[in-house]
């Protein structure tokens, strides 16, 4: 009976999400393997988040709007492990917008989800950021490593969206 009601609840939750995400990829987790964590297909998952790499070239504002329509934001990177996971799926000759910007050019960088900007957990390339005219951040491959660079926000780039996993 308990298992039946849990399955019914799951199915109704899945139906609810189906109007936003036609397909979900779920894995069982939790100590009793009773919880399912899901990401929209074909998003990838890492820890408690889902990631989508958009190859559509758009400005920073349009990239953020694009993520928003999918219930996500441009990616907020909190750890080196998270960055290492993300970069496994990136192309080394491309650049991708992050959810990091400095809209007033005061070098007050801010994350789209209001996560405090912590200078100790940043991965700027050497010498970056280097221009207050360049108010948006990308991640790209330079000098044999992935790192961040400040660029003009209106220049179209690829982008990375991030959302919380869906638990059912």
């Amino acid at each position: 009976n308990f298992m039946y009601s849990k399955t019914v609840k799951r199915l109704s939750k899945l139906q609810e999400y189906q109007q936003y995400y036609p397909s979900l990829t779920c894995v069982m987790e939790g100590k009793d393997m009773e919880d399912w964590s899901c990401c929209p297909t074909p998003w990838t998952s890492f820890q408690s988040s889902c990631y989508f790499i958009s190859t559509v070239m758009q400005s920073w504002t349009k990239s953020q709007n694009n993520c928003s329509v999918m219930g996500a934001d441009l990616v907020v990177i909190n750890t080196k492990e998270e960055q290492d996971f993300i970069t496994q799926n990136l192309k080394i000759n491309s650049a991708y917008f992050l959810g990091l910007s400095d809209p007033k050019g005061w070098r007050h960088w801010q994350w789209v989800d209001q996560t405090p900007y912590n200078k100790n957990v940043t991965f700027w390339h050497s010498g970056e950021p280097n221009s207050p005219d360049e108010r948006c951040a990308i991640i790209n491959f330079r000098s044999e490593e992935w790192g961040w660079n400040d660029v003009h926000c209106h220049v179209p780039q690829k982008s990375i969206c991030k959302m919380k996993k869906i638990y059912i």
């Epitope: 400005s59 504002t61 050019g105 221009s131 207050p132 005219d133 360049e134 926000c153 209106h154 179209p156």
Partner: antibody, heavy 121, light 111 residues
Framework: EVQLLESGGGLVQPGGSLRLSCAAS????????MSWVRQAPGKGLEWVAT????????YYPDSVKGRFTISRDNSKNTLYLQMNSLRAEDTAVYYC??????????????WGQGTTVTVSS | DIVMTQSPDSLAVSLGERATINCKAS??????????VNWYQQKPGQPPKLLIY???NLESGVPDRFSGSGSGTDFTLTISSLQAEDVAVYYC?????????FGGGTKVEIK
């Protein structure tokens, strides 16, 4: 007073090359992103190229990508536009302009008087 | 590319009267409460001059008879009381996404 003085325009044959210069004064040139904008005779305005203050990032529309190169020499307060493989449709007055950011966008706030490029055989 | 469509192509207005120029973007040029549209004035034989930025902000030194409004895809430049020195071509421009694109221009003349 901000002054931008373009030079280097002239008559060139199709397929030829030309290098435009823009000498800036009255601004701290090395801190400014700079752009080139052109205007064909009797026509509207078309953005041609942008370079950031350090000169390490350059941007072009598809119409000139691979043919035009924007560069700068901050020690000489001068902006350049190297134009190769010129076509008749590149005939225009070429203006250099200073770029001012506005949140996630920008404005072109100071403009030079322009230099005329004519591509014709 | 974002296409900026201006109307009318030309406009004849009596001195002291109001002139209104419209600009329509092919997609929204707004984000987070700001609109990325600028207006420029170009007099014969001169380079363009910035009048309005961010759809409605008057550039320093520009007379306050000029004003801008609009958001999303629809923008307007208004000259509240036309003066002889306002005879020019006016251009809108979007800076939301490269390539920056300009409207085709509106020629303002005195009736």
């Amino acid at each position: 007073e901000v002054q931008l003085l373009e030079s280097g325009g002239g008559l060139v044959q199709p397929g030829g090359s030309l290098r435009l210069s823009c000498a800036a004064s009255g601004i701290t040139f090395s801190t400014y992103t700079m752009s080139w904008v052109r205007q064909a005779p009797g026509k509207g305005l078309e953005w041609v190229a942008t370079i950031n203050s350090g000169g390490d990032n350059t941007y072009y529309p598809d119409s000139v990508k691979g043919r035009f190169t924007i560069s700068r020499d901050n020690s000489k307060n001068t902006l350049y536009l190297q134009m190769n493989s010129l076509r008749a449709e590149d005939t225009a007055v070429y203006y250099c302009a200073t770029y001012r950011p506005y949140y996630y966008g920008s404005v072109l706030d100071y403009w030079g008087q322009g230099t005329t490029v004519t591509v014709s055989s | 590319d974002i296409v900026m469509t201006q109307s009318p192509d030309s406009l004849a207005v009596s001195l002291g009267e109001r002139a209104t120029i419209n600009c329509k973007a092919s997609q929204s040029v707004d984000y987070d409460g700001n609109s990325y549209v600028n207006w420029y004035q170009q007099k014969p034989g001169q380079p363009p001059k910035l009048l309005i930025y961010g759809a409605s902000n008057l550039e320093s030194g520009v007379p306050d008879r000029f004003s801008g409004s609009g958001s999303g895809t629809d923008f307007t430049l208004t000259i509240s009381s036309l003066q002889a020195e306002d005879v020019a071509v006016y251009y809108c421009q979007q800076s939301d996404e490269d390539p920056w694109t300009f409207g085709g221009g509106t020629k303002v003349e005195i009736k």
